[in-house]
């Protein structure tokens, strides 16, 4: 007979990412004997919850809980039965619920209560459902990216932990209702609200982060539509040949469009609006989303928000990736430089509805928004955050790293399950090569 080495036991964790437009479930796994290593936690499986985000169930809170059942049933199958009780389960809600909480706190509470009721029916170790702050969303996205890319520590050949020579990667997240920018900075923040101090594996990180509510892709599109209704009889960002009937109540019900809301309007009135394929007017419309008129600090990004100069390389994920990927793959346009990104946005905005449909067969109405989306991404990066050509060269557009989705979910779980120690493991403490 000979000894057969058993594979190391695996541990699991589940995070429900309750975004503004939809909810995604991520199941993570890691070897139990290596849980303090960096980059050791990876994605086991995922599931997209059918239907809208939980904030869309404001009028039917129980439906929010019910919507999660299909994915939770998948989790029962994906996580070995003997691991169910020891598997932490979290739900984090982001900007869609932040907006609902602003406009209707009672409905927000009811929705969270309903999802909590559903989640407690399952045999996992449920550890709460809550709304993340914009700062948490940004920082946990940054932690996820750098953890997956093993930027915090490395396990050396001599069996010691050491700090790698490479720096950390900045993180840019474009969600449905908000956008986040997070990066390591050397100088102290002039605005304390935008600085986070982290201690990870014995190393200290000073991180700048800011979340812009109402600057997520979907809310931007809605704000642009509201602006087009206000200033034009057409929509310059929509393709010529695309016409839609708009219920005014749908446009103005979001707290993000309150600035464009007429003092009196008939919410049940339906107006017709057509596209005009006008890249220059579209750019002007998008520019109107950013204010550079006042800055109470030495420097700002936009809307009077402090931001140090962007430094180092960045990963841009979620809708940043989807927008740029559409330009690259569906449209076949180069986007390696800021100039190319701008040219690509202009190219899409010049297309008629018929041209777009012919160029990207199969897709339907979603095509109408790519001009505005591309123009917004280009303006946000260049004018909003202040990326010049050199800095833009250090931005990678990616949705995954190490076969794991990049987003706040993994960083959130790593933090709450103490999978990233503040200090390096004592028995394997090595030389600090900083």
């Amino acid at each position: 007979t000979r000894d057969i080495r058993e594979p190391p036991a695996l541990k699991y964790g589940i995070v429900l990412d309750a975004g503004s437009s939809h909810t995604s479930m991520f199941i993570y796994k890691w070897p139990a004997d290596k849980e303090n290593d960096t980059g050791i936690v990876g994605q086991h499986s995922s599931c997209d919850v059918p239907g809208g985000g939980i904030s869309s169930y404001a009028d039917n809170p129980s439906g929010a809980g019910q919507s999660l059942v299909g994915c939770l049933e998948q989790a029962l199958r994906d996580v070995p039965k003997e691991r169910h009780a020891g598997t932490p389960l979290y739900l984090g809600a982001t900007a869609g619920m932040r907006l609902l909480n602003l406009t209707n706190p009672e409905a927000s509470t009811s929705v969270l209560t309903a999802v909590t009721h559903t989640l407690t029916q399952y045999p996992f170790d449920f550890r709460g459902a809550r709304i993340l702050s914009g700062q948490e969303e940004g920082v946990f996205g940054w932690v996820t990216a750098n953890y997956l890319l093993e930027n915090f520590i490395k396990y050396g050949w001599v069996g010691r932990w050491f700090r790698p020579r490479k720096g950390t990667l900045g993180a840019m997240d474009l969600g449905g209702a908000s956008t986040q920018i997070t990066f390591e900075t050397t100088s102290p923040a002039e605005d304390r609200a935008s600085e986070v101090q982290l201690r990870l594996y014995g190393q200290h990180y000073r991180v700048y982060t800011h979340s812009f509510l109402c600057y997520g892709r979907d809310q931007v599109l809605q704000r642009l539509l509201a602006s087009a209704l206000q200033t034009h009889s057409f929509h310059p960002c929509w393709p010529r040949g695309f016409s839609t009937h708009v219920l005014l109540g749908d446009v103005y019900q979001s707290p993000c469009t309150v600035a464009q809301r007429p003092q009196t309007f008939n919410s049940s009135a339906r107006v017709s609006l057509s596209g005009s394929s006008d890249p220059h007017l579209c750019r002007d419309l998008v520019s109107g989303l950013f204010s550079f008129s006042s800055c109470p600090f030495s420097r700002c990004s936009f809307n009077g928000v402090f931001q140090p100069p962007v430094a180092g390389n960045f990963i841009a994920f979620s809708a940043f990736f989807y927008t740029v990927n559409f330009l690259r793959t569906s449209m076949g346009l180069p986007v390696a430089t800021l100039q190319q990104l701008e040219a690509a946005a202009v190219n899409v905005c010049n297309q008629t509805w018929a041209q777009l449909q012919a160029r990207v067969p199969g897709q339907q109405a979603h095509l109408a928004d790519y001009c505005a989306g591309a123009m917004f991404v280009q303006q946000l990066l260049s004018r909003g955050y202040g990326f010049d050509e050199r800095a833009f060269g250090g931005v990678i557009f990616q949705k995954k790293a190490a076969d794991t989705a990049v987003g706040w979910a993994l960083g959130y779980m790593l933090n709450l399950t103490n999978l990233i120690p503040a200090d390096p493991p004592g028995l394997r403490k090595g030389t600090d090569f900083s």
């Epitope: 239907g51 869609g96 209702a177 009937h245 018929a354």
Partner: antibody
């Protein structure tokens, strides 16, 4: 109130071209909407043939694209369907319909839903020798 | 193209009873949390008329006894309390992908 009315021959010989016209009243076909042709084979479901937009752009069902032409006559506020090289399989009730993209909010996300909300009564076309 | 399969082909219901019609898509008709599914009613000798759009939104002027639900590939049209005038053929239609496609129809008969 928008109204649509189909007209054209009820009998077409195989290999010939089927020609139908839809007259729109109560709305200018250049003002908005997508002007569709849809057909229904006997005892079967509905099949979208294609449209001509208010802007004169065409969009056809790929399965029929090589045989279909949809055009318009703005002076008469009409749009027409031509289907070439017909066979018995093209025997159907042909409808014209006005469609548009309806903007609607779902989950804080504005979306565009293509609906066809004004229809003609339909005209039966038989392909037979 | 997206193929829509409706069931049952025929449904016989007494007035006041509930009627449920199913529509299954060969691929998801959802995009970013929204469902691109519409329902139409066609009475004998008449043109179809729009009942529901975006899976669950009732078209104006349609009685509240009609409702739609579902997402992804599975959708349902429900008539909570059938009335004699509801005798018709009901069609689902997707607009997520070009070309727009319709289901084969479900004929609702009133007993």
């Amino acid at each position: 109130q928008i109204q649509l009315q189909e007209s054209g021959p009820g009998l077409v010989k195989p290999s010939q071209t089927l020609s139908l016209t839809c007259t729109v009243s109560g709305y200018s076909i250049t003002s908005g909407y997508y002007w569709n042709w849809i057909r229904q084979h006997p005892g079967k479901g509905l099949e979208w043939i294609g449209y001509i937009s208010y802007d004169a752009d065409n969009n056809y069902n790929p399965s029929l694209k090589n045989r279909v032409t949809i055009s318009r006559d703005t002076s008469k506020n009409q749009f027409s369907l031509k289907l070439s090289s017909v066979t018995a399989a093209d025997t159907a009730v042909y409808y014209c319909a006005g469609g548009y993209y309806r903007y609607g909010l779902g989950s804080y996300r504005g979306s565009y839903y293509y609906v066809m909300d004004y229809w003609g009564q339909g005209t039966t076309v038989t392909v037979s020798s | 193209e997206t193929v829509l399969t409706q069931s049952p082909a025929t449904l016989s219901v007494s007035p006041g009873e509930r009627a449920t019609i199913s529509c299954k898509a060969s691929q998801s008709v959802d995009y970013d949390g929204n469902s691109y599914m519409n329902w139409y009613q066609q009475k004998p000798g008449q043109a179809p008329r729009l009942l529901i759009y975006a899976a669950s939104n009732l078209e104006s002027g349609i009685p509240a006894r009609f409702s739609g639900s579902g997402s992804g590939t599975d959708f349902t049209l429900t008539i909570s309390s059938v009335e004699p005038e509801d005798a018709a053929t009901y069609y689902c239609q997707q607009s997520n992908e070009d070309p727009p496609t319709f289901g084969g129809g479900t004929k609702l008969e009133i007993k």
